[in-house]
């Protein structure tokens, strides 16, 4: 299953399959997730080691048993790959690293006014993988405001150095935020020239294209079909690049297919997995296990659940079957692709779904451990769980926020439905940033069921929580995916990085905002909060947040939306925007429904008809 815990001051011994430099443990974990054989990783921050060569070292590891011995190493961070972790799988990495220079091939230098602009330039340059920006206080005047666009053979820095007044980061192309746009066209009977960066075997051009999309240096590809004239080159997928970023020439060639990486697509990237099953095809590779199962779909599920399994073949040969079950061969290779592909067989083959974003219906397993007033504009995909709850009577208007917590579930505030309990009048918009982008053609979700907490009473602040079951499940994308729920009764975690988001009023007597707003607000103890609200009872099932001096808060229209906190690199839904005295008033914090206190209720209500939990929270 999905294991997200990080081990502080621990280093996994042995099992190395690759090493690289990464700026932090989260990026190292992402590289492990996308490496075909990596199950575990260990990261050495600069502070953890004197050896300059090993600073920022990210060590990717494999293990037949799924684990390795841990040794104590002060400052080191270790953990698991996020394979099998559904919506948490993403190659998108937005963080900016201050005081760090990520080295690589500098191929473009320009003057820009901010690190954000430098990151945008990198994202809009086809060859840029990461960048460094020298701030206005950099010690050498001639380098100030320089934006250096970079690449490297492996897509990660060739070295990382601590350097004052330098900020570094990665391209946001994997976040589907590139302005370049992509070529969806595939060209039949055409071969591209230029430099081959890798060669893998694939059953069709679509798998070849997805592999190209997630390969750090692939810009385009040529695939040789299973009837290509040279037998040894059949099913070969050549991943390619060029100086210009486009093929310098193409040659008409029977039984070849060519196309482009989809990494520069805006708003939608293909999933980093291949779910198609290929009948009459055998995939060869290193044998991991052989098991008897009923049907090819069960074989694929078995492969997906066995974390080291990369692909499989389900044999229908009479000698491989007994009763209704046949042999399911679970296999792996060094590069994650079959080492041999055979056609016209009695088998069906396919790939593990361990890297599919959708995962199962569960929301998230994590480690136990109102426009916004005074806020700023959010950017695409920054808060992909945020939804807008809108009512369509004669006109249509935004009324509340909400948080996507599963394919078919939204968590919001009960008071949003005061006087409007009819599910037919509601429209739920997900994956949006600007309310003005909503037109009559914009897809929306309808409500199947509104589940208001049984103890909620209108115009009281208690138990202000409601679940919405959507009529149809939503697919997950970089712009529309769920937020992890906290552990039941989560009291031990100290959250220091919390944000509230919404399209609500920007002042007490304001109006709904167009662009989703965000504001960073500190949590306030319940004791402190109670002092500020003498006339109300602040219960243990509430959480408060706000600045003593006011000025930043949720407001009308943000209700039901999320209060999220980042801990150990993972966002969790800590609160639901509920109520407050005015908005952003001095010494009047916002009051939020404490989600951790309602975990039993959430899990009980989201049980599917077959008894399987539709969301999963930490044990």
């Amino acid at each position: 299953g999905c294991l997200t815990q990080l081990y502080e001051n621990a280093f996994f011994r042995g099992g190395d399959v690759a090493s690289m430099y990464t700026p932090n443990a989260q990026y190292c974990q992402m590289r492990c997730t996308f490496h075909p054989r990596c199950l575990l990783f260990s990261f050495l921050p600069a502070s953890s080691i004197n050896d300059m060569e090993k600073r920022f070292g990210c060590f990717l590891k494999d293990s037949v048993t799924g684990t390795l011995p841990k040794v104590h190493r002060t400052g080191a961070v270790s953990g698991h790959s996020l394979k099998q972790c559904g919506h948490q799988i993403s190659a998108c990495h937005r963080d900016i690293y201050k005081g760090v220079d990520m080295r690589g091939v500098n191929f473009n230098v320009s003057k820009v006014s901010s690190v954000e602009e430098c990151q945008k330039r990198c994202t809009s340059n086809i060859r840029c993988q990461f960048f460094s920006y020298a701030t206005q206080t950099f010690h050498k005047a001639e380098y100030r405001n320089n934006c250096l666009l970079k690449y490297s053979p492996g897509g990660t820095p060739t070295a990382i150095k601590v350097l004052s007044n330098v900020e570094s980061g990665f391209s946001l192309k994997p976040c589907a935020l590139s302005e370049i746009g992509c070529h969806m066209n595939i060209f039949q009977h055409l071969a591209f020239s230029d430099v081959d960066v890798a060669r893998v075997l694939t059953p069709d051009a679509f798998v070849c294209r997805t592999i190209c999309t997630y390969h750090p240096n692939c810009l385009f590809f040529t695939f040789y079909t299973n009837v290509w004239k040279i037998e040894s080159q059949r099913n070969v997928c050549l991943l390619k690049t060029s100086e210009s970023g486009t093929p310098s020439s193409s040659t008409p060639q029977e039984n070849t297919i060519s196309g482009y990486s989809l990494l520069t697509c805006k708003r939608t990237l293909p999933e980093p997995c291949h779910s198609k099953i290929y009948p009459g095809v055998d995939f060869g590779g290193e044998e991991l296990n052989v098991t008897f199962v009923k049907g090819v779909n069960v074989c694929q599920e078995t492969c997906t659940k066995m974390i080291r399994c990369q692909f499989f073949t389900y044999s229908l040969l009479p000698e491989d079957c007994k009763e209704e079950k046949c042999k399911c061969f679970l296999r792996l290779s060094m590069d994650g692709s079959p080492t041999r592909i055979a056609y016209g067989t009695q088998g069906s083959s396919g790939y593990s779904l361990r890297l599919c974003n959708t995962g199962d219906n569960s929301v998230c397993t994590t480690k136990t451990s109102t426009r916004i007033v005074g806020g700023t504009n959010s950017s695409w995909g920054e808060w992909p769980w945020q939804v807008s709850l809108q009512v369509k009577l004669t006109a249509q208007r935004h009324l509340c926020g909400g948080s996507l917590i599963g394919h078919q579930w939204v968590l919001t505030a009960a008071h949003c439905f005061d006087g409007l309990p009819l599910q037919d009048v509601w429209r739920i918009y997900s994956g949006i940033l600007n309310l003005s982008d909503i037109t009559k053609d914009t897809p929306f979700s309808q409500i199947k069921e509104i589940i208001i907490h049984q103890n909620y009473k209108v115009s009281e602040g208690n138990h202000d929580i409601a679940l919405i079951k959507l009529q149809a499940p939503l697919n997950y994308t970089e712009f529309q995916k769920p937020i992890c729920l906290p552990s039941k009764g989560d009291t031990s975690t100290i959250y220091t990085n919390c944000w509230v988001t919404g399209w609500g009023f920007s002042k007490e007597k304001g109006e709904i905002q167009n662009i989703l707003q965000k504001v960073n607000i500190p949590l306030v103890t319940n004791e402190e909060c109670q002092k500020r609200y003498q006339d109300y009872k602040i219960t243990q099932r509430m959480v408060c947040a706000g600045y003593k001096e006011g000025g930043k808060d949720a407001c009308k229209g943000d209700s039901g939306g999320p209060l999220v906190c980042k801990h150990n690199g993972m966002w969790r839904l800590v609160g639901i925007t509920s109520w407050g005295e005015g908005c952003a008033r001095r010494e009047q914090p916002g009051v939020y429904t404490k989600v951790a206190e309602y975990m039993d209720w959430i899990l009980e209500k989201t049980q599917s008809s077959d008894g399987k939990a539709q969301m999963q929270s930490p044990a």
């Epitope: 969806m184 595939i186 039949q188 009837v227 293909p270 779910s275 016209g344």
Partner: antibody, heavy 118, light 107 residues
Framework: EVQLLESGGGLVQPGGSLRLSCAAS????????MEWVRQAPGKGLEWVSS????????IYADSVKGRFTISRDNSKNTLYLQMNSLRAEDTAVYYC???????????WGQGTMVTVSS | DIQMTQSPSSLSASVGDRVTITCRAS??????LNWYQQKPGKAPKVLIH???TLESGVPSRFSGSGSGTDFTLTISSLQPEDFATYYC?????????FGQGTKLEVR
């Protein structure tokens, strides 16, 4: 010119049999998956069966499984559909089609009519 | 089996109009989606494969887009010869299934 030409259709009684043929020309027949698709009068398209280039792998729609058999003779550049235990609901125009490199049915025959009636 | 749902089932339009036909798959099919045109008494003809790749010889006024479950066929400026029935089809998994068709008629 790339071409597919079906033959063998006609009127047959329920429970009867018929063998359809599809002659291919203008391309390397043994390089491609081949398909049979049918269309009942006034209705939409329904995929019937598929065969791999070597003939080693065959797939059928549930509606015809156990009654129809797809085969090919690469030396004769010909695709076949043996239809047994025919029913009234099998009445349709039957098309043979080539599955192209990108899995679309890129070349179609002109179709042959099969009528199952007593 | 994967169900393919086309909308609308029929459409009246005039020469020069921009026309859009949508196709929804009951589960994600990546870009394994093809569009066909069929005229009365004739065999279908492929227009677009892999969701957006135009078949050679097909006029550029035809375009396709989409991935996953939602797909669109657009005719940017309708010509007299475009009045026909259009089908989408998934080639993601067997049984390969077609949409029920969209009949494009003269207004």
């Amino acid at each position: 010119e790339v071409q597919l030409l079906e033959s063998g259709g006609g009127l047959v009684q329920p429970g009867g049999s018929l063998r359809l043929s599809c002659a291919a020309s203008g391309f390397t027949f043994s390089d491609y998956d081949m398909e049979w698709v049918r269309q009942a009068p006034g209705k939409g398209l329904e995929w019937v069966s598929s065969i791999s280039p070597s003939g080693g792998s065959t797939i059928y729609a549930d509606s015809v499984k156990g009654r129809f058999t797809i085969s090919r003779d690469n030396s004769k550049n010909t695709l076949y559909l043996q239809m047994n235990s025919l029913r009234a609901e099998d009445t349709a125009v039957y098309y043979c089609a080539r599955q192209g490199l990108l899995t679309a049915f890129d070349i179609w025959g002109q179709g042959t009519m099969v009528t199952v009636s007593s | 089996d994967i169900q393919m749902t086309q909308s609308p089932s029929s459409l009246s339009a005039s020469v020069g109009d921009r026309v859009t036909i949508t196709c929804r798959a009951s589960q994600s099919i990546n870009t394994y989606l093809n569009w066909y045109q069929q005229k009365p008494g004739k065999a279908p003809k492929v227009l677009i494969h892999a969701a957006s790749t135009l078949e050679s010889g097909v006029p550029s006024r035809f375009s396709g887009s989409g991935s996953g479950t939602d797909f669109t066929l657009t005719i940017s400026s309708l010509q007299p010869e475009d009045f026909a029935t259009y089908y989408c089809q998934q080639s993601y998994s067997t049984p390969y299934t077609f949409g029920q068709g969209t009949k494009l008629e003269v207004r």
